[in-house]
């Protein structure tokens, strides 16, 4: 499901239930947001005018979406997952009797649950979780999120120490579903795929529709923006990132000290000033480096270039080239080559293109 692509999230209370004092409503909603900000890097601030990310509404019956409320009891509230417009908004059924205590329906407890949905959580099957689908009063003074709730929200946003999430509102990220979108570099990292572009990378977990956008600097503060090539040696938990004539080594997602180093340590001639794309093939234990219209092949075991290179891309990768932007290896038999907004699935055993796609096809666009 969707997540908020930023750290700083605004909310606005559109109107107030007559069942409670306004201050008590404000307090209950503020404390409910705090429950989630305590365990994530998210920060919530209340605004009183203008367009908030999350609109809190008290309404009865039909109220502007397909999900009309049903009078007292039954559905107490509902909330929409992250997104623009109605996305994130939390609606509370005015036909309930909202309270600060155990009588009626406790606003704080209901709001914690609904805000969970506003942040992208679904329901939990753990009866102890606040995201369990049925309402049950618990003492609000000793209320705690369950381990399942925390696991769920941190799988979306990380823990509070990780300042690893997503750009702030003023950083403009490229539009993921722009049909003209191209990438600077792409690589697998375990079961994830990292797509690099400018200051950002998108993270795609294999076979799942969810993707998240991140600032490169928020994950690796010592690395530059504009990564130009990347490859992974999964068996060693290593990722190599390239920009200009330098490269960085990431081990177990942490940058190694004493980097960057010169790309010429791989054995490139001096005229090579940057790498366009790189991919490691674990079947041959070779890394392919693409530079302009040529490529080199590097033996990772012997730590040296194979003889007879460079070769022309177009000669040895039928239908690919003359230049490429990015490439990664997947499913034991494919290279995915990126050229501008196009992507080519290339079977390296059959040595031919098997599919032509848009570069952003991995994101359900």
């Amino acid at each position: 499901g969707p997540v908020w692509r930023k750290h700083y999230i605004t909310y606005r209370i559109n109107n107030y239930t007559p069942d409670m004092n306004r201050e008590d409503v404000d307090y209950a909603i503020r404390k409910a947001f705090q429950v989630w900000s305590n365990v994530t890097p998210l920060k919530f601030s209340k605004i009183n005018t203008g367009m908030a990310d999350i609109l809190v509404v008290f309404a009865r019956g039909a109220h502007g979406d397909f999900h009309a409320f049903d009078g007292k009891g039954g559905i107490l509230a509902h909330a929409f997952g992250p997104g623009s417009g109605i996305g994130g908004d939390a609606h509370f059924d005015e036909d309930e009797f909202w309270t600060t205590h155990s009588g009626g329906t406790n606003l704080f407890l209901t709001a914690v649950h609904e805000i969970g949905h506003s942040l992208g959580l679904g329901h939990s099957s753990d009866p102890k979780a606040v995201m369990f689908p049925t309402y049950k009063y618990v003492d609000i003074n000793t209320f705690r999120l369950s381990a399942d709730d925390i696991r769920g929200i941190q799988s979306l946003y990380g823990d509070p120490k990780e300042n690893q999430r997503l750009p702030n509102p003023d950083n403009s990220e490229p539009a993921l579903c722009d049909p003209n979108l191209s990438f600077d570099a792409v690589t697998t990292v375990g079961n994830k795929i990292f797509f690099f572009k400018d200051r950002f990378f998108w993270l795609k977990v294999s076979e799942r529709p969810k993707t998240s956008v991140n600032l490169i600097s928020s994950l690796w503060p010592t690395l530059p923006s504009g990564i130009e090539a990347a490859y992974e040696i999964e068996a060693r938990n290593q990722v190599f990132l390239f920009k200009d004539d330098k490269y960085w080594l990431i081990s177990n997602l942490r940058p190694e000290p004493n980097y960057p180093k010169s790309i010429h340590s791989f054995g490139f001639p001096n005229f090579v000033k940057k790498i366009d794309a790189a991919v490691f093939n674990p079947r041959f234990y070779r890394t392919y480096f693409f530079v302009d219209n040529q490529y080199w092949r590097y033996d990772e075991r012997r730590q040296m270039m194979d003889p007879g290179y460079p070769k022309l891309i177009t000669k040895n990768f039928q239908g690919i080239g003359p230049k490429i932007d990015a490439v990664f290896y997947s499913k034991n038999k494919y290279y995915y080559f990126f050229q501008g907004s196009n992507q080519f699935e290339y079977d390296f055993l059959l040595q031919r293109i098997t599919k032509t796609l848009k570069s952003n096809s991995w994101f359900g666009c």
């Epitope: 609109l55 397909f66 999900h67 929409f80 417009g85 109605i86 996305g87 359900g364």
Partner: antibody, heavy 122, light 103 residues
């Protein structure tokens, strides 16, 4: 590129039945709400029915309740509208529309098919 | 039940004109209002969502405003391709439509 392609329209007698299909491609179909919207000749748009991602939650306009059934097959990326007890006033172009949301429907239709014409006449 | 009233039902204007179409709900719908454009023989296309957000690819001469019960769609300078029918919509309810014709 998102594509929605309706089929199954045609001429049917009052009281008859018809099943419309909408084949979806270019996006991951299963997480999204899907809807049918119709337009009688020379008239405005009328929302007909909507269905949640898993198919468990459905909504209908009062004008078709009890006569039309919306369904979906996520394995085939296809939306359906079974129309029974058809009346002359059901004559319209029927559009399939994709909601921008899952979980709860926003009723915001970001992509539409080209429509299929249903004519109910004796 | 919520009802949407759109006005005017038709409108004649010239290229370069500024045009405003209004939509009124009989109860608050917050900012949950969308605008669509439909050309003859074509499917509707989303222009504006959440009252004022411009759908990707829609020219900036289109703008929307309003919240609660009163909403407007404005075309700042009409272009030949803008002559079409416009609908406001909230969940399962569409306005009656406004046909924009060349004067």
């Amino acid at each position: 590129e998102v594509q929605l392609l309706e089929s199954g329209g045609g001429l049917v007698q009052p009281g008859g039945s018809l099943r419309l299909s909408c084949a979806a491609s270019g996006f991951t179909f299963s997480p999204y709400w899907m809807h049918w919207v119709r337009q009688a000749p020379g008239k405005g748009l009328e929302w007909v029915s909507g269905i949640g991602p898993s198919g468990g939650l459905t909504f209908y306009a009062d004008s078709v309740k009890g006569r039309f059934t919306i369904s979906r097959d996520n394995s085939k990326n296809t939306l359906y509208l079974q129309m029974n007890s058809l009346r002359a006033e059901d004559t319209a172009v029927y559009y399939c529309a994709k909601d921008i949301r899952g979980a709860y429907s926003s009723g915001l239709f970001d992509h539409w098919g080209r429509g299929t014409l249903v004519t109910v006449s004796s | 039940d919520i009802q949407m009233t759109q006005s005017p039902s038709s409108l004649s204007a010239s290229v370069g004109d500024r045009v405003t179409i209004t939509c009124r709900a009989n109860q608050s719908i917050y900012t949950y209002l969308n605008w669509y454009q439909q050309k003859p023989g074509k499917a509707p296309e989303l222009l504006i969502y959440a009252a004022s957000s411009l759908q990707s690819g829609v020219p900036s001469r289109f703008s929307g405003s309003g919240s609660g019960t009163d909403f407007t769609l404005t075309i700042s300078s009409l272009q030949p391709e803008d002559f079409a029918t416009y609908y406001c919509q909230q969940a399962g309810i569409f306005g009656q439509g406004t046909k924009l014709e060349i004067k």
